[in-house]
Amino acid sequence: SIPWNLERITPPRYRADEYQPPDGGSLVEVYLLDTSIQSDHREIEGRVMVTDFENVPEEDGTRFHRQASKCDSHGTHLAGVVSGRDAGVAKGASMRSLRVLNCQGKGTVSGTLIGLEFIRKSQLVQPVGPLVVLLPLAGGYSRVLNAACQRLARAGVVLVTAAGNFRDDACLYSPASAPEVITVGATNAQDQPVTLGTLGTNFGRCVDLFAPGEDIIGASSDCSTCFVSQSGTSQAAAHVAGIAAMMLSAEPELTLAELRQRLIHFSAKDVINEAWFPEDQRVLTPNLVAALPPSTHGAGWQLFCRTVWSAHSGPTRMATAVARCAPDEELLSCSSFSRSGKRRGERMEAQGGKLVCRAHNAFGGEGVYAIARCCLLPQANCSVHTAPPAEASMGTRVHCHQQGHVLTGCSSHWEVEDLGTHKPPVLRPRGQPNQCVGHREASIHASCCHAPGLECKVKEHGIPAPQEQVTVACEEGWTLTGCSALPGTSHVLGAYAVDNTCVVRSRDVSTTGSTSEGAVTAVAICCRSRHLAQASQELQ
Amino acid sequence: QEDEDGDYEELVLALRSEEDGLAEAPEHGTTATFHRCAKDPWRLPGTYVVVLKEETHLSQSERTARRLQAQAARRGYLTKILHVFHGLLPGFLVKMSGDLLELALKLPHVDYIEEDSSVFAQ
């Protein structure tokens, strides 16, 4: 019978008695930086090439005995999870192993750096097809390790790493915190975050998605036909490395940004029980469990978007937080969120020739997050149109006036501390979808984009009585690009996108009480690209 | 994910013009920084990754490493260059006393220095 983890990542159309999805990653090479491995294990024999690279520290303790099976345990299991004959994800993928962890599973940042450099040099000497690098390890936050990962990613390599087994914010660890790396948390057969002893999987905004990581059956280094169950975010990362190999084998030209967006898009949504995470991390942690795409081709027509949260701004009066998209992505909208509700909005601004999303804290606020909506939009030309605070009582408004430009997102930013207190809401006039509206004391920013075949529409959902959360979702075939709240509701904590749903959060209604300002309206901007759809149909 | 100026411990050692002379100081107005792991038990003091500015060539990296060794020797310190990086990041890995950090941070082309630390199987 198919192990639970392989069943979980397999779309229903592939599910038979045997896990045999088409094209098992044969065009892709997966590098594994880990312990030594038992390369003659039945599961991985002929699939894994052991390089001569080794950079490991001495084992701790005088009583430590090097037992080959223990030394090889972690790496052998992971190689089996990625490409094992019986229990592997990408059965056709070839692998190369580098030893950067000793027999106790311990390595150094410097050893890992030298390993990454070795991969880059190998890539330059003998260019092959797509490369995936699996980093099933974690240390404390390291600027240099993150920088090396960034450079390798910008050289076209896909890096996948473990979020860490510390039941902590993954942003405090490396390489998990590197933005260019695909960071994977672990879930179990019940789609619960994995508990490991007293700790468990890491979480937070630095995690891209989760994957099976508890009770994973794979090759055991105890003997050449042995299997064993291992658990951890390494196992989860190995699943995603396998899925990435499958996707890249089907579409070798995929960029890192495209691959990440597809991994997110094809993941199972909202299946993880978030109660396991600390309360302040729930909104930041993606509720996504990795899965193979239902078919290897034909995803190109979709407009893919993801939500990127910034680091917390900190509580100082002028503190700001910045969220950035990847180099190949377009920032289509920008929103902000504050648990205290004290914020001064957000704006899109140019930084180093690229748009970023900046959120502003307010006096007495505990800090803010900036939330960027980052999308894949080929041949896009996007700009931000700003209207300064208006004097008129009707409020500030701005629209996309350039021919062929459509509105993809609205942001508003204000200097006053308590915008909208005791002021009636400003309603956006109907029939003007290409317009952003805000308070007269706020400056309003419209994200306007031109791209072949891009069309967008505004969708609203308003609730007259106070509610802690108001949502509005884009329908099938449309992708959420913008998420904001209609102005005038002073108790709004902020707005953010979760998959294809716009979420507007308000203060706990039990503390605010019902007032005339209780109305909350969530505004979603939903877009699609007819151009991408046509291009896909022509390919087929 | 994490910004480059994220949640980690940073020690900024200010530049002072000393006996090594201004000719060896970095470009005006830039301060090389020192970083180390915020988790104390994972620190590996005595080994440091010296990261040089982005466009530094291999020959400059090697020259900078030799200069560090020479200046350290003048102060009676033994150092060992364990690896010279090129291909991903310019820089070098050096085994030396932490007493030499202030000196190393003043070397030309230095962007930042990071103390080595442990990583673990997950």
Partner: antibody, heavy 130, light 107 residues
Framework: EVQLVESGGGLVQPGGSLRLSCAAS????????MSWVRQAPGKGLEWVAN????????YYVDSVKGRFTISRDIAKNSLYLQMNSLRAEDTAVYYC???????????????????????WGQGTTVTVSS | DIQMTQSPSTLSASVGDRVTITCRAS??????LAWYQQKPGKAPKLLIY???SLESGVPSRFSGSGSGTEFTLTISSLQPDDFATYYC?????????FGQGTKLEIK
């Protein structure tokens, strides 16, 4: 679905020997520790012995040490219990069970996390009587 | 060897009742305790592992708690199918021991 099927039980005289077998299906057999548990008529459960995935580690309850030997054949997906010097008090239904557990790394330590005996056979009866 | 003592030995209850079974270890076993249900002529079935984690497929009316030496199994609202014998098992080391069992019968 993993299934365990015991065989080899029967009537044996005190001092005699018996070899119990447990056949398993699927690669999951070799992935876990395995145990033998027995239950005397009208009594509670008593753990007898267990064995690591590769057979390199074995543990026994004190009352059977030196008399019983647990073993497994990975190629045949089978678990065995060789019972020698049988006594009347060894009369029981013998179950084989899968010890579901997993290994994980934390801070350079290789740890074992045990879930319990999650798959059981239907049992085979051993009667020791003259 | 670690001894496990269950109480009560027998428990009479009605459908809909909330029942609690206790298991005491002779020394600390941290949270390394499992609970099983066994019906006459059948093999035992794993309900709870690591003191409080519910095994997949087990109804949520079953819950476990405790650590160290004192543990409890609670059935929040008894169903007709729950009348059976319940065993605790420690696995603090690779050698295991079971409690003597608690028979839950219809009042």
């Amino acid at each position: 679905e993993v299934q365990l099927v015991e065989s080899g039980g029967g009537l044996v005289q005190p001092g005699g020997s018996l070899r119990l077998s447990c056949a398993a299906s699927g690669i999951t057999f070799s992935s876990y520790w395995m145990s033998w548990v027995r239950q005397a008529p009208g009594k509670g459960l008593e753990w007898v012995a267990n064995i690591k995935q590769d057979g390199s580690e074995k543990y026994y309850v004190d009352s059977v040490k030196g008399r019983f030997t647990i073993s497994r054949d990975i190629a045949k997906n089978s678990l065995y219990l060789q019972m020698n010097s049988l006594r009347a008090e060894d009369t029981a239904v013998y179950y084989c069970a899968r010890d579901r557990g997993t290994y994980y790394y934390q801070d350079g330590n290789y740890n074992y996390y045990y879930y319990g005996m999650d798959v059981w056979g239907q049992g085979t009866t051993v009667t020791v009587s003259s | 060897d670690i001894q496990m003592t269950q109480s009560p030995s027998t428990l009479s209850a009605s459908v809909g009742d909330r029942v609690t079974i206790t298991c005491r270890a002779s020394q600390s076993i941290s949270s390394w305790l499992a609970w099983y249900q066994q019906k006459p002529g059948k093999a035992p079935k794993l309900l709870i592992y690591k003191a409080s984690s519910l095994e997949s497929g087990v109804p949520s009316r079953f819950s476990g708690s405790g650590s160290g030496t004192e543990f409890t199994l609670t059935i929040s609202s008894l169903q007709p199918d729950d009348f059976a014998t319940y065993y605790c098992q420690q696995y603090n080391s690779y050698s295991y021991t079971f409690g003597q069992g608690t028979k839950l019968e219809i009042k």
